[in-house]
Structure formats: structure tokens, C-alpha cells
């Protein structure tokens, strides 16, 4: 089964996923896709990254992250109830059937009608942009490497628990990810 | 025009091998998954393989992967199948087939089909 | 894998009718199914994808519903062109399964 995430509308959620590139810059293709993953790619692609850079996106769908190191987790901006649902993360690595792939499920809930200010769950400070710039491009799979045979599941459920950017590091430097070459 | 027209077919004894080709047109074909399936005579059809828009990822029909090889070459335009130690169950006719794309979509259904070449394995 | 079951395996109509034809998946495929026509001697060729949606140059008359394992192909009207045998296929898990096939027939 998925594991879960949630949201209030109107809050940017989080979905993580990383994997720990080979090299600097040996980048792995990655897409993102509402609803749970199908055989090849992701059905219904919000966002697709290639060997270099982010070549297809969809608006309110971004990654946070520096992507260029591995962390291609989502952020969804400003989220509404139907914004709810499974989406796929697949990180594309090259040889025969080698994807991994990573079904996560996005709850959302009604905001609170409340007077007292609450700590909003929003990523945007923990994980500040680092793309400047994204540009269309054919959806190519092209990327070195190889997958030892690592079960990474728990992954969502460690990175479910990311407040802030240490965290995030934490994590990442806990071998918690999918690690190429 | 999209075209998808597939050679190499033939007869050829058990343990034998052959090389199927896959000739596309009418559309930029590195920017396509791409797909064998296969029907028995009389029977359905079987996907056998698909392979990525630069051949650099592979997906096989388990029973088959240690006899069967998926590739393509883009500078040609072409998709290839090259099949050993063939048995008489891969008599079938052999599709070559183009996976639908356009952005915000995934490549798991078919939307170009060639004719098929027939393989028929037998002593 | 993923079964794929389809029923009936053979069906006799007339022009006019309207036809429907099932397709049961072993386990949850969501909204991951295909539709495919194909006549004798000839490929097959893409109906319906994603359960519901109509494959560009595909007449009204055809329509797909149902989510999870449960699905239907449906002719609102035959035409004599539409007797041929159909296909459902799976694109959630590896392999791509297709169903055995249903041969529509005039009676």
C-alpha cells in the first residue's frame, strides 16, 4: 500500500523521492505522474526531468529540491481537495526493467477555521527553489549507471517526517536513498 | 504518414536464430518508446519487449529475456529484435509497435501498429 | 502477472445492436486499460486508452468505462464494419498482459 501524505488546501505539500546520482551531474530521468505508476514512464506526467535539467512541467508542480544531487521530491503549490490522490514517482535508471518506483499517496484536508496562528506543514522555507530556469524539451531517457539490489520503501516514511532542510540532509546522508553505480 | 514495417521473418529450425527489423517513418522516432507483440497463429496477442526512447532502458516478457534483445538504432530510424534459441511456441506473427506519446503522457498503449512478419519455428 | 479475462469470448449481433463487452483484471489496475480492434489479417488498432478515452479518428459509437478490475467496451450501434475481435490489455503491472479476445460476429 502507498504511504501517506498530507496537506491542507491551500498549503504546498511535499512528496519525497530521492536517489544519490552515480556522479556529479550523472543525472538519472525522473517523472512525476498523477496517479499510481503504470508499466512504462507516468501516466498523467506533471513534471519529467532528463540527464541535465527539469524539461517538462506543469504549473503549481515543482521540485525543491536541488535535483542535481538526487532530491527530486515534489512540491504541489497552493493544494485544493483535488489535488487528493496517488501520485508516481519513477526514477528511470538505465538496464532491463531497472525502474524504481515509488507510489505516494496525498491526502488533503479542509483547512482549519481557526483565530489562533498555526505552524503550517509548507516546505517552501526548509527547501528554498533552486531552479531559475525550466524549459520544454523531448521526454528522453538518457542516463549511465546501475541498481544494486537495495529495498528503499522506507524512504517515504523517513522523509514524511522532513521539517526542515537539516533533516532533509540527515536523511540523505543516511544512506536512505537509491543509490546508482 | 506513420509507417511501421517489420522483415526478417521466416522459417527457421528449432535453436535457430533470427533478427526481426522494424522500419519507421512518418514521425520522429526518438521520441518513442517502442514495442514487439506477438500472436500465434489463431491465438491473442503477447507483448514481448519495449524498449525507451534511447534504448538505454529495456522492458522484457520474463520467459523471454535470456533468449530475446530488444534495440533500436535512431540515426536509422529503426527497431530490431534479435531472437536465439528459438523454439516451435514463438511461431506467431510479429508486431512492431510505436508506444502513444505526447507530453503528460506515458507510452503504454499502442497507437501505430506495422503488419506484422511471420516467425515460424520448425524442423 | 496481471490476468486478464474477457467476456464473452465470442458474441453473434446484428447492425444496430448495441454491444458490450467485459474485461475482468485479476488485482486493481486503476484506470490503466486499452482497448484494441483487430480484423483478420490485419495489426491491431488502439480503440480506447486510459479505460475511457477515445483514440483520435475513433467514431462515438465506441465508449469505455470502469476502474479497478471491472471494465466494459461498449457499440452503441453496430456498424458492419465493427465485426472483428477485440482486445483489452493491462498497462499497470509488468508484463503488459492483454485479454484472450472477444470475436464479434454477425448473426
Known amino acids: 500500500s502507498e504511504v501517506e501524505y498530507r496537506a491542507e488546501v491551500g498549503q504546498n505539500a511535499y512528496l519525497p523521492c530521492f536517489y544519490t546520482p552515480a556522479a556529479p551531474g550523472n543525472l538519472v530521468p525522473v517523472c512525476w505522474g498523477k496517479g499510481a505508476c503504470p508499466v512504462f514512464e507516468c501516466g498523467n506526467v506533471v513534471l519529467r526531468t532528463d540527464e541535465r535539467d527539469v524539461n517538462y512541467w506543469t504549473s503549481r508542480y515543482w521540485l525543491n529540491g536541488d535535483f542535481r544531487k538526487g532530491d527530486v521530491s515534489l512540491t504541489i503549490e497552493n493544494v485544493t481537495l483535488a489535488d487528493s490522490g496517488i501520485y508516481c514517482c519513477r526514477i528511470q535508471i538505465p538496464g532491463i526493467m531497472n525502474d524504481e518506483k515509488f507510489n505516494l499517496k496525498l491526502v488533503i484536508k479542509p483547512a482549519k477555521v481557526t483565530p489562533a496562528p498555526t505552524r503550517q506543514r509548507d516546505f517552501t522555507a526548509a527547501f528554498p527553489r533552486m531552479l531559475t530556469t525550466r524549459g520544454h524539451g523531448p521526454a528522453e531517457t538518457q542516463t549511465l549507471g546501475s541498481l544494486p539490489d537495495i529495498n528503499l520503501t522506507q524512504i517515504s516514511t523517513l522523509a514524511n517526517e522532513l521539517r526542515d532542510s537539516r533533516l532533509a540532509n540527515d536523511l540523505r546522508d543516511s544512506g536512505a536513498t537509491i543509490r546508482i553505480g | 504518414e506513420v509507417q511501421l514495417v517489420e522483415s526478417g521473418g521466416g522459417l527457421v529450425k528449432p535453436g535457430g536464430s533470427l533478427r526481426l527489423s522494424c522500419a519507421a517513418s512518418g514521425f520522429t522516432f526518438s521520441d518513442y518508446y517502442m514495442t514487439w507483440v506477438r500472436q500465434a497463429p489463431g491465438k491473442g496477442l503477447e507483448w514481448v519487449a519495449s524498449?525507451?526512447?534511447?534504448?538505454?532502458?529495456?522492458y522484457y516478457l520474463d520467459s523471454l529475456k535470456s533468449r530475446f534483445t530488444i534495440s533500436r538504432d535512431n540515426a536509422k530510424n529503426s527497431l530490431y529484435l534479435q531472437m536465439n534459441s528459438l523454439r516451435a511456441e514463438d511461431t506467431a506473427v510479429y508486431y512492431c509497435a510505436r508506444g502513444y506519446y505526447y507530453y503528460g503522457s506515458s507510452p503504454n498503449y499502442f497507437d501505430y501498429w506495422g503488419q506484422g512478419t511471420l516467425v515460424t519455428v520448425s524442423s | 502477472d496481471i490476468q486478464m479475462t474477457q467476456s464473452p469470448s465470442s458474441l453473434s449481433a446484428s447492425v444496430g445492436d448495441r454491444v458490450t463487452i467485459t474485461c475482468r483484471a485479476s488485482e486493481n489496475i486503476y484506470s490503466y486499460l486499452t482497448w484494441y480492434q483487430q480484423k483478420p489479417g490485419k495489426a491491431p488498432k488502439l480503440l480506447i486508452y486510459n479505460a475511457k478515452t477515445l483514440a483520435e479518428g475513433v467514431p462515438s459509437r465506441f465508449s469505455g468505462s470502469g476502474s479497478g478490475t471491472d471494465f466494459t467496451l461498449t457499440i452503441s450501434s453496430l456498424q458492419p464494419e465493427d465485426f472483428a475481435t477485440y482486445y483489452c490489455q493491462q498497462h499497470y503491472g509488468t508484463p503488459l498482459t492483454f485479454g484472450q479476445g472477444t470475436k464479434l460476429e454477425i448473426k
Open positions: 524498449i525507451n526512447y534511447d534504448g538505454r532502458n529495456t
